[in-house]
Amino acid sequence: KSSNEATNITPKHNMKAFLDELKAENIKKFLYNFTQIPHLAGTEQNFQLAKQIQSQWKEFGLDSVELAHYDVLLSYPNKTHPNYISIINEDGNEIFNTSLFEPPPPGYENVSDIVPPFSAFSPQGMPEGDLVYVNYARTEDFFKLERDMKINCSGKIVIARYGKVFRGNKVKNAQLAGAKGVILYSDPADYFAPGVKSYPDGWNLPGGGVQRGNILNLNGAGDPLTPGYPANEYAYRRGIAEAVGLPSIPVHPIGYYDAQKLLEKMGGSAPPDSSWRGSLKVPYNVGPGFTGNFSTQKVKMHIHSTNEVTRIYNVIGTLRGAVEPDRYVILGGHRDSWVFGGIDPQSGAAVVHEIVRSFGTLKKEGWRPRRTILFASWDAEEFGLLGSTEWAEENSRLLQERGVAYINADSSIEGNYTLRVDCTPLMYSLVHNLTKELKSPDEGFEGKSLYESWTKKSPSPEFSGMPRISKLGSGNDFEVFFQRLGIASGRARYTKNWETNKFSGYPLYHSVYETYELVEKFYDPMFKYHLTVAQVRGGMVFELANSIVLPFDCRDYAVVLRKYADKIYSISMKHPQEMKTYSVSFDSLFSAVKNFTEIASKFSERLQDFDKSNPIVLRMMNDQLMFLERAFIDPLGLPDRPFYRHVIYAPSSHNKYAGESFPGIYDALFDIESKVDPSKAWGEVKRQIYVAAFTVQAAAETLSEVA
């Protein structure tokens, strides 16, 4: 049967009808509406926006729209006791203080409740000491400092530039190095594109602009006080000393005007190489401490933020499926912002709103999807993916049995160059086929498909004529669905032509200057890129919810498993003596991948041939596809990261934003030459190979004929 017959609808209500209903002008209006005041998690303004969205989704025609609230740990600056950093002289006098707020953008001078820049969840404290410049504060930067340069960060305040890796990893690395405070700053090398003006005259970061953000190391736990369980009315909460992922040293972010004042006085060691130099007119000396004339001066931090259990609100909308109402396709993105949220998140929320409106229009005309579609407006994403994680914890039993797919919908744009997609390999073919049917919005590609412009601008490094699709990492609301629950997930947005700066974000990220005008004037005046992202996200949801056979191709998983096995093998073989000494074999893993490849191939053949009019067999085959992602979940989780349970993918232990393949083996091998007990370390490598091989083999067997 066709999908139209299966869902008892008229033929005109197909994907085309859904896509044609999406309008750029509506996305523009919704973005404007969502960005006029701040919507910080835990505030009245964000609660009011939740109720507005609930009301509008009901008007659009969803079957039900409910608020799901949780009481989670959030963090706010002290309104009467501001955070700042000083340079103090030998008498303890403050001879320089960093700014207390960002100069507001034009038109927003009288807006209240703009939270000043702060590092969410920083503990209180007033440490003072010598400064050490630690570059991006990556693992390799601290290796360079400690091992090569013999610089000790213990008892020092470190200053690190934003970019390359998640800020929480920077703080963790600084803590492990013994630092007593961290200053984060935006260097123009990373947040000021050459030839572009500063906001409000362009999309670059002005010197007074500052990136806010949380500095947690939650590793997928959700609310720090209720790991594994929802923060509901009867929750048992940990004491703050036992909370998950909180930093132990004060942290504060600053802009590059203030950073200049701190860095220009730096003495001590010269930067080890040019990769440690940014674009400020300072020497980028590493320290410790200030140069000759200023050697008696110190840096002092003044941090007075508080952690508070606060109510948050998700909005959950339901469009019931006509044929398989117990199969859920989820489209979710967050609503809370640091300030106005012009890009993050409201460029995504506006797209979700328009997708809901389009689906609602079809529903009012008598159409229903085959499967149930759930729409979510998550709260407190900026405070550690809290809203999505708490909801998933509350509904985990339903989700693990009924969850088909999760499509994420945070920022629709981080540039206007080309498409960027990160997803499970199961969705590669879906994304390829969909983008071949969509028109490219790019200049010079008029009349061409999105697939064509995307492939031209962002080619796959392995397969010619195909576009790059990246691994899922974390730092967004898909985390709990993919990394913890094993629900096939994907995300799509428009991005910049800036591969070297992949994880630094756009210049005005998390600053007060992320406004509606930023998007309307500089990024997407016609909202054509937003519309394209709506078509990609909405089209994926439509296909996942409406196709008779789920649009997953298990053969693509086989291809990447082989690639990932090859990669981790080559990393391991860089230690041939130890491999030999400890008899480390990859036979089990390569054998499992071989079996997976053969079984996936046979499954795909059966998928072409089976009787789709037999609902029992159809459901059986679809369940095998749905549960394949689930089969990669290890109930015990990864070592020391129990909520990262996917054996094939996890957020990198060194950068939450990046995905790592075979993370258990990778982490066991990382820096293994420095381990004090090599026998134990290589034993753990062997154990992780065993776990990976078993998991791949077990997943393969879920695709075998059932009897």
Epitope: S570, M573, M579, F586, D587, S591
Partner: nanobody, 112 residues
């Protein structure tokens, strides 16, 4: 029983080329990654290059741009094309499946 047999070693002048081969048996060659590892006189083992089951190639920094690894699955054979050879490339070159299955090695001497 897994077997790996190297050949192609010998004496070559600096700047010269050599091609090593490794014929394998006892396992489904096409489904496994394999490596070249070397041991210079009086030194420890050094990984040189690997080729994945999927055909992806990996090289040590010391040989990148000079050595090329390849495989012919139909012949169950692994190759290492070594160009622009230097004195420091002098070593016994081993074909290895992993830490367990290795060949006996073939000696490459680079000397004028």
């Amino acid at each position: 029983e897994v077997q790996l047999v190297e050949s192609g070693g010998g004496l070559v002048q600096p700047g010269g080329s050599l091609r090593l081969s490794c014929t394998v048996s006892g396992f489904t060659f096409s489904s496994y990654a394999v490596s070249w590892v070397r041991q210079a006189p009086g030194q420890g083992l050094e990984w040189v290059s690997a080729i994945g089951a999927g055909g992806g190639t990996y090289y040590a920094d010391s040989v990148k741009g000079r050595f090329t690894i390849s495989r012919d699955n139909s012949k169950n054979t692994l190759y290492l094309q070594m160009n622009s050879l230097r004195a420091e490339d002098t070593a016994v070159y081993y074909c290895a499946k992993d830490g367990v299955d290795w060949g006996q090695g073939t000696l490459v001497t680079v000397s004028s």
